[in-house]
């Protein structure tokens, strides 16, 4: 069964679980003793087309309802757990008095006054954040919404929207709360070459091949222009007229501590003596900054097998 | 000294196509990004994009996505921006400039545009 | 797109006052990762290319006057001229370079009263 919650002595207006899209009549009931909840407003608790109206919640309503859409082929039941609670006296609102949670984002956000949709309700809807009425500018209640511009990680929080509820010539107060937080947008930063280290000195065999591989990491998310590239004697290796030498086609991307990283290699065919006296430059390099670490390579010491 | 020196102005027809150049000198040309940026007469000042001259790495302003291409040559140290689809509304003064940088050993911190091109006045008019 | 607002749009000093032109982003323009703002500062006479004065939101560019500060932190900022001269008749820009798009104010003129 569903469950509805509401606060004692505010208005709660709950539908049957059951009703999809029909347009069929609507029977309530208590659960536990069969009874015909009525549909004349004069009572506190009626029902109205497919809804149940507590018009002032009490605690003593919490049970559990029934609700059956009578239609020719067949009747469908619901059942609909509802628990009415006093007031909590502080501020800490708990978790069963909380609807779902918002996410939002670095830009602009709005949160939705929840179960709004069920009143007859006029604006302004009045929202508090962890009890305290929001007054910045930043804040703009617009029809059911609450709209937050620049949001920081220091707008997360329990958001609390109330409202009236008209019924009958007669005012309700309604008030629904939901947590609000900031998705962990993502960072960008000087780039870190995480290998080769900085004047780092790689052993070679003359006619062999060599691959160098530079990795480095540039934040998390969207990176804007984030590159890294290989240059020789400070010439990008398209431009330095050495067919042996070529810088891999496509970076590798990859993830690294919760950091967006790329790799590029540098792939020798075959080692020359030029080789060795060659400067080989990892370049990293984003909006922030370029950094630059240099290579060397030398001839590999035969072992020693005496 | 370090200089970027723009080519001249032109005069287009609505609809047509203009490349300005924009050639660096006194520095490396690969270790900055150049930007573009343009002012309209009495206007301020408009970002368009930008480029790193070693990979060619572009990124540019929403608004003219689609019509600019911004290249650069290493071989002549020199910057390109091609401006497409011409409209009266793109009369204006472009500018090149290059991205300041703090060097320290090896590092470049980037930041704001401290070498700035002559501009090239594009008057677009039927 | 971060949105650079500049105040006042004109501004007119007496030579040797003090001149301050105010600029606010939309949203914070500094970077937790290294404490740097990441604001410019540009002036540009008629006919003229823009011309750096103030980086990093407050340090100098070289051969600028040391009349020219900047300052602030976050999404407020201020440029001060503390003594206006003739040669700073001119009109303001402040950009941000923390997130693409740059942007920059709508550029604030000065002239003399």
């Known amino acids: 069964s569903k469950s509805s919650w509401g606060l004692e002595n505010e208005a709660l207006i709950v539908r049957c679980p059951q009703r999809g899209r029909s347009t069929y009549p609507v029977e309530w009931y208590y659960s536990d003793t069969n009874e015909s909840i009525p549909t004349q407003k004069r009572n506190r608790i009626f029902v109205s087309r497919d809804r149940l109206k507590f018009l002032p919640a009490r605690v003593e309503d919490s049970g559990i309802y029934a609700c059956v859409i009578r239609s020719p082929n067949l009747n469908k039941t619901g059942y609909l757990n509802v628990t009415i609670h006093k007031k909590p006296p502080s501020c800490n609102i708990p978790d069963y008095l909380m609807y779902s949670t918002v996410r939002g984002s670095d830009k602009n956000f709005k949160i939705t006054c929840p179960t709004i949709d069920l009143y007859n309700w006029t604006a302004p809807v009045q929202w508090f954040k962890n009890c305290k009425a929001l007054q910045e500018p930043r804040f703009r209640a617009h029809r059911s919404y609450l709209f937050i511009d620049n949001v920081t990680h220091d707008d997360e929080g329990d958001y609390t929207c109330q409202f009236t509820h008209a019924e009958n010539g007669t005012n309700y107060i309604v008030t629904a709360t939901r947590s609000f937080t900031v998705e962990e947008k993502g960072f960008s930063m000087f780039p870190v070459i995480t290998n080769p280290p900085y004047n780092h000195t790689m052993e070679v065999e003359i006619g062999k091949p060599a691959s160098i591989a530079c990795s480095a990491c540039f934040g998390k998310g969207s990176h804007f222009l984030a590159d890294v590239l290989w240059q020789i004697n400070k010439t990008v290796v398209g431009n330095f007229g050495e067919a042996r030498i070529q810088e891999e086609e496509g970076r590798n991307e990859s993830s690294s501590n919760d950091m967006d990283c790329l790799t590029s290699v540098l792939r020798i065919t075959g080692v020359t003596e030029k080789d060795l006296s060659l400067e080989y430059d990892c370049l990293a390099l984003n909006l922030h900054g370029m950094i630059r670490h240099t290579i060397r390579l030398r001839r590999k010491q035969p072992i020693d097998h005496r | 000294q370090v200089q970027l020196v723009q080519s001249g102005a032109e005069v287009k027809k609505p609809g047509s196509s203009v490349k300005v150049s924009c050639k660096a000198s006194g520095y490396r040309f690969t270790d900055y990004y150049i930007h573009w940026v343009r002012q309209a007469p009495g206007q301020g000042l408009e970002w368009m994009g930008i480029?790193?001259?070693?990979?060619?790495?572009?990124t540019y302003a929403q608004k003219f996505q689609g019509r600019v291409t911004i290249t650069a040559d290493e071989s002549t140290s020199t910057a390109y921006m091609e401006l497409s689809s011409l409209r009266s509304e793109d009369t204006a003064v472009y500018y090149c400039?290059?991205?300041?940088?703090?060097?320290?050993?090896?590092?470049?911190?980037?930041?704001?545009?401290?070498?700035w091109g002559q501009g090239t006045t594009v008057t677009v008019s039927s | 797109d971060i949105v650079m607002t500049q105040s006042p749009d004109s501004l007119a000093v007496s030579l040797g006052e003090r001149a301050t032109i105010n600029c606010k982003s939309s949203?914070?323009?500094?970077?937790?990762?290294?404490?740097?703002?990441?604001l410019a500062w540009y002036q540009q006479k008629p006919g003229q290319p823009p011309k750096l004065l103030i980086y990093w939101a407050s340090t100098r560019e070289s051969g600028v006057p040391d009349r020219f500060s900047g300052s602030g932190s976050g999404t407020d900022f201020t440029l001060t001229i503390s003594s206006l001269q003739a040669e700073d008749v001119a009109v303001y820009y402040c950009q941000q370079y923390y997130s693409v798009p740059l942007t920059f104010g709508q550029g604030t003129k000065v002239e003399i009263k």
């Open positions: 400039a290059r991205v300041g940088a703090t060097v320290t050993k090896n590092y470049y911190y980037y930041y704001g545009m401290d070498v």
């Open positions: 949203q914070s323009v500094l970077y937790s990762s290294n404490n740097r703002n990441y």
């Open positions: 480029i790193q001259p070693t990979g060619g790495g572009t």
